[in-house]
């Protein structure tokens, strides 16, 4: 099994993967296979109403650049506080004991894997110890040690909407064959998206591929700078009783998903007021409705907030509210 795989992202479309060769390989390692697939955002993120008081936005981090060759794994996306700081709780005695047991088990298990499970993978149909997965056509990079061109994932993961994650059959997973080195730059990835990366060491190329069980690592690409900006105009309509319906287009390819919109509006000469529009409310209204506005000239700006943070404020839109008698509550149904 390849050791200590580390995945980091250096851009919104690339992940760098590094690893160490197996400590005790069965024969010579001829090449490595790297598979990757896009991961769906945690379904819980879709359920929460981030406009509710006291509910903090999830601060998803991408996988940061390497600190050094021997730096710790920076692979899992984490929930962080607003300062971006994470600290682990002190370990209990039972946790320490459990980790020691796991460490011991891992050594024994890896020995077992090397001796028993390191079996041939046949690419054509036949009998014997076959890989149960479908065979995959692979593009070889030959013996060139520094070529790291990756298969773009656009075809494998067409963007059907701002937050959809298509479920591709396993045989369509993009992958790369890596020869004579222990690193790979995976390119053509979607911005601010989590990927699950699978790494296998192989000690025979033809006629039968003999590969280890996989080591897994996860990484998230960096955010795209303007992906969370609302494109196009903010439109409005003033209905009777001065109900103002504001509408805007959601960002087409946001960083992860849009969790809320901030509506900032002010009457000329007054303080700015803020309104939070949840993802669910936006899905119903394609915007929001304002009530209870005193007569006067208003300006309004809107920005989206995604898993990666805030987009830019839109250009101000202006409207005029005439005088009327009854003033109901603030945000309309």
């Amino acid at each position: 099994v390849p050791l200590d795989p580390i995945s980091v992202s250096n851009s919104s479309s690339q992940i760098i993967l590094k690893w160490k060769p197996p400590s005790d390989p069965n024969g010579n390692i001829t090449h490595y296979l790297v598979f990757w697939e896009r991961q769906a955002e945690d379904s819980e993120l879709f359920e929460l109403d981030y406009c509710l008081k006291g509910l903090k936005l999830p601060s998803r981090t991408w996988s940061p650049p390497f600190e050094s060759e021997d730096s710790q794994k920076h692979n899992q996306s984490e929930y962080e506080d607003s300062a971006g700081e994470c600290c682990s709780c002190p370990k209990t005695d039972s946790q320490i004991l459990k980790e020691l047991e796991e460490s011991s088990f891992r050594k024994t298990f890896e020995d077992y894997l090397h001796n028993v499970v390191f079996v041939p993978r046949k690419t054509s149909s036949g009998t014997g110890a076959e890989d149960p997965r479908p065979s995959r056509k692979r593009r070889s990079l030959g013996d060139v040690g520094n070529v790291t061109v990756a298969v773009p994932t656009v075809a494998a993961f067409p963007n059907t909407s701002s937050t959809s994650v298509p479920t591709s059959p396993e045989e369509h997973r993009p992958f790369e064959k890596v020869v004579n080195k222990e690193s790979l730059v995976i390119s053509g990835l979607r911005h601010f998206t989590g990927y699950r990366i699978e790494l296998q060491a192989c000690n025979q190329d033809t006629p039968e591929e003999r590969c280890s069980v996989a080591a897994y690592v996860s990484a998230r690409t960096m955010p795209e700078a303007k992906a969370d900006d609302i494109v196009g105009p903010v439109t409005h309509e003033i209905f009777e009783n001065n109900v103002v319906h504001l509408m805007w287009q959601e960002p087409k390819e946001p960083n992860g998903l849009i969790v809320l919109y901030e509506v900032s509006y002010r009457r000329y000469g007054d303080e700015e007021l803020h309104l939070c529009v949840s993802r669910k409310h936006f899905a119903l209204e394609r915007g929001c409705r304002l009530r209870g506005l005193s007569p006067g000239n208003y300006s309004v700006r809107i920005r989206a907030t995604s898993l990666a943070g805030n987009g830019s404020w839109t250009e101000p839109t202006y409207f005029y509210v005439t005088d009327y008698l009854d003033v109901p509550s603030n945000i309309a149904k």
Partner: antibody, heavy 119, light 108 residues
Framework: EVQLVQSGAEVKKPGESLKISCKGS????????IGWVRQMPGKGLEWMGI????????RYSPSFQGQVTISADKSISTAYLQWSSLKASDTAMYYC????????????WGQGTLVTVSS | SSELTQDPAVSVALGQTVRITCQGD??????ASWYQQKPGQAPLLVMY???SRPSGIPDRFSGSRSGNTASLTITGAQAEDEADYYC???????????FGGGTQLTVL
């Protein structure tokens, strides 16, 4: 391509239960409300209710409250409409539709499921 | 009875302009949407909000609203426009949606 695919036609007896389905694809199922619309033979469209699959928030038209149950399983991108005890008057074409473009507008529709209730 | 009222039937000569109306108190405070339904087919959204057309809908279709009345206008009606047309908006509470009774459009 956005698609809503509904389950096939059903023939049932009064008093029986039924659950029909609507599978969404080509978009983020959890991010859009899904609604159900009834059309009785030779009649107009009737808005039954909507569900937000992200958190299963459901809103029923007063006419259908207590008569049907709308639910969703986001893990398989499917919405459901069910009856615990069918009546002959439930005979109709039932459409699922996605609230998408604009305010309270159904921008994509399923092909419809014909439910026939007869003794 | 529906909270949105439509004329049951309207006819128009080929190539002429026709206006289909939808009346209801809720239209003073909410947008209307319009759907076209041909026999044996699911409804199709043709107009929403102030005057927005989904992609693929010809520009001969337009929408407007004044007071408690929303209108769908077809300028230069074609034979393929013959269908039932339904308006849709919120009910007076604003919590639910309702459809109008439908207008059968005949192109002569």
């Amino acid at each position: 391509e956005v698609q809503l695919v509904q389950s096939g036609a059903e023939v049932k007896k009064p008093g029986e239960s039924l659950k029909i389905s609507c599978k969404g694809s080509g978009y983020s199922f959890t991010s859009y409300w899904i609604g159900w619309v009834r059309q009785m033979p030779g009649k107009g469209l009737e808005w039954m209710g909507i569900i937000y699959p992200g958190d299963s928030d459901t809103r029923y038209s007063p006419s259908f409250q207590g008569q049907v149950t709308i639910s969703a399983d986001k893990s398989i991108s499917t919405a459901y409409l069910q009856w615990s005890s069918l009546k002959a008057s439930d005979t109709a074409m039932y459409y699922c539709a996605r609230l998408g473009s604009g305010s309270y507008s159904f921008d994509y529709w399923g092909q419809g499921t014909l439910v026939t209730v007869s003794s | 009875s529906s909270e949105l009222t439509q004329d049951p039937a309207v006819s128009v000569a080929l190539g002429q302009t026709v206006r289909i109306t939808c009346q209801g108190d809720s239209l003073r405070n909410y947008y209307a949407s319009w759907y076209q339904q041909k026999p044996g087919q699911a409804p199709l959204l043709v107009m929403y909000d102030r005057n927005s057309r989904p992609s693929g809908i010809p520009d001969r279709f337009s929408g407007s609203r004044s007071g408690n009345t929303a209108s769908l206008t077809i300028t230069g009606a074609q034979a393929e426009d013959e269908a039932d047309y339904y308006c849709n908006s919120r009910d007076s509470s604003g919590n639910h949606a309702v459809f109008g009774g439908g207008t059968q459009l005949t192109v002569l």
